[in-house]
C-alpha cells in the first residue's frame, strides 16, 4: 500500500483550512481520550478511480468520499483519520486530515474527498474514515467502514494501468488447443513482442475429478525479433492413460517487467462426449 506521488496533498476547501499528514493509524485521542467527540461520518462512498503520476504512469486509486452529519458535534471535529487495510496481507496505511480552523455550519453539507491511496488489481480493501478525536472507550463509535474489491487485470479499464501492463496484461496469446491422434495435443499461441522465454504447463484430469493424473512442462526458448507476434506451435505427447482426458494448458511468459510473476493464460480441452449407444443385441439367444 502506498500513496500516489508525495506531492502536496490538499484537503482545504472554502471555509476550512486543512492539511494532510502521514499517520501511524494510532491517533493521540486513543491514548488521551477527550470528553467531547464528534459524530460519525455520513454516506461514505468508495469508488475506483484512475490517476496519473508525475511520470505519466496510470494507477488505480481508491476515491474516498464522505459527508458530515448536520449536528452540533462539528464544533468538536478536529479532523479525520483515513485508513486502508488490504485484507489478504493485513497491511494498513493511514493519513490524517488535520483541521487548522474551526468548522462552522454553512448553507450546504460539508463534503470531503481523498484519491491518493494506490490499490492493487484483484485485491480487497477495508476503507475506514474515523472522525477525530476518537470516542472515549465506551462512547458511540464515530467511524464508518466499507469493503472494496478492485477488478483484476482482465478488466478492460484495468488492463491499461501501469501495474497490469507491467505484468503482461496487453499480451493476448489467443491459445488454441486441438487433440491429435496418438495421444498428442497441438498447442498454438501468439508470441509477444519481447525476446523472452515461455513455459507451457500441461495438467490432465479424469473426466469428473479435480486431482491430476498427468503433468508436463514444456520450455519454449525466446523468439527472435522476426518471430514476434507470430504463432508458436507445439506438440505435446500425453500419457496413455484411459480416462485421463481433460487437459488444462497454461502458458507462462517471463517478460522482463514481471519475470516469473507474469499473468498466465490458460485453455482447457474437455473430455470427448460419450455417445449414448445402446447395448448391442446379440443375433441369437443362448439357451442355457
Amino acid at each position: 500500500l502506498r500513496l500516489l506521488d508525495h506531492r502536496a496533498l490538499v484537503c482545504s476547501q472554502p471555509g476550512l483550512n486543512c492539511t494532510v499528514k502521514n499517520s501511524t493509524c494510532l491517533d493521540d485521542s486513543w491514548i488521551h481520550p477527550r470528553n467531547l467527540t464528534p459524530s460519525s461520518p455520513k454516506d461514505l462512498q468508495i469508488q475506483l478511480h484512475f490517476a496519473h503520476t508525475q511520470q505519466g504512469d496510470l494507477f488505480p486509486v481508491a476515491h474516498i468520499e464522505w459527508t458530515l452529519q448536520t449536528d452540533a458535534s462539528i464544533l468538536y471535529l478536529e479532523g479525520a483519520e483515513l485508513s486502508v487495510l488490504q485484507l489478504n496481507t493485513n497491511e494498513r496505511l493511514c493519513v490524517r486530515f488535520e483541521f487548522l480552523s474551526k468548522l462552522r455550519h454553512h448553507h450546504r453539507r460539508w463534503r470531503f474527498t481523498f484519491s491518493h491511496f494506490v490499490v492493487d488489481p484483484d485485491q480487497e480493501y477495508e476503507v475506514t474514515v474515523h472522525h477525530l478525536p476518537k470516542p472515549i472507550p465506551d462512547g458511540d463509535p464515530n467511524h464508518q467502514s466499507k469493503n472494496f474489491l478492485v477488478p483484476d487485470c482482465e478488466h478492460a479499464r484495468m488492463k491499461v494501468t501501469t501495474p497490469c501492463m507491467s505484468s503482461g496484461s496487453l499480451w493476448d496469446p489467443n491459445i488454441t488447443v486441438e487433440t491429435l491422434e496418438a495421444h498428442q495435443l497441438r498447442v498454438s499461441f501468439t508470441l509477444w513482442n519481447e525476446s523472452t522465454h515461455y513455459q507451457i504447463l500441461l495438467t490432465s484430469f479424469p473426466h469428473m475429478e479435480n486431482h491430476s493424473c498427468f503433468e508436463h512442462m514444456h520450455h519454449i526458448p525466446a523468439p527472435r525479433p522476426e518471430e514476434f507476434h507470430q504463432r508458436s506451435n507445439v506438440t505435446l505427447t500425453l500419457r496413455n492413460l484411459k480416462g485421463c482426458c481433460r487437459h488444462q494448458v497454461q502458458i507462462q511468459p517471463f517478460f522482463s517487467s514481471c519475470l516469473n510473476d507474469c499473468l498466465r493464460h490458460s485453455a482447457t480441452v474437455s473430455c470427448p462426449e460419450m455417445p449414448d449407444t445402446p447395448e448391442p443385441i446379440p443375433d441369437y439367444m443362448p439357451l442355457w
Epitope: 462512498q45 469508488q47 469493503n147
Partner: nanobody, 127 residues
C-alpha cells in the same frame, strides 16, 4: 439511455423455484458489478446478492445463502437470480442494480453504492 429491466417475478408456492432476469442497456455491462436488492411490503430495502464484473465472485445475504444463486451473461448484457426453496418471507419487490464505480462493494452496507435501479419485479410466495 441507461436502463435496467427486470422480469420473471410472479406468484409461487413455498418450496418452489423462480428465476429472475435483468436486461441492461445504455452502458458497458461487463465493466460493472451488479446486485439484486429487494423490498418486502412495508419494509426497507434489503441487499440480496452481488456479483463482480466477470462473475469471479458472488456474495449473498445470510437470509438467502444456499437457496439463491446470482449469475450473469456478459454477452447478453443480462443478470440473473435463481431462487430455490422459496419462503413466504421472500415475498418482495426485487430490484436489479448497477454499481456506481468499477470496483465491487460486496455486502449489505453497499446500498448507497448503486446508481442505476430497475423498476423492480414482484415475487409473491404464498400457498
Amino acid at each position: 439511455e441507461v436502463q435496467l429491466v427486470e422480469s420473471g417475478g410472479g406468484l409461487v408456492q413455498p418450496g418452489r423455484s423462480l428465476r429472475l432476469s435483468c436486461a441492461a442497456s445504455g452502458f458497458t455491462f461487463d465493466d460493472y458489478a451488479m446486485h439484486w436488492v429487494r423490498q418486502a411490503p412495508g419494509k426497507g430495502l434489503e441487499w440480496v446478492s452481488g456479483i463482480t464484473w466477470n462473475g469471479g465472485r458472488m456474495d449473498y445475504a445470510d437470509s438467502v445463502k444456499g437457496r439463491f444463486t446470482i449469475s450473469r451473461d456478459n454477452a447478453k448484457n443480462s443478470l440473473y437470480l435463481q431462487m430455490h426453496s422459496l419462503r413466504t418471507e421472500d415475498t418482495a419487490l426485487y430490484y436489479c442494480t448497477k454499481e456506481r464505480s468499477l470496483g465491487y462493494c460486496g455486502g449489505d452496507s453497499c446500498s448507497d453504492a448503486f446508481d442505476i435501479w430497475g423498476q423492480g419485479t414482484m415475487v409473491t410466495v404464498s400457498s
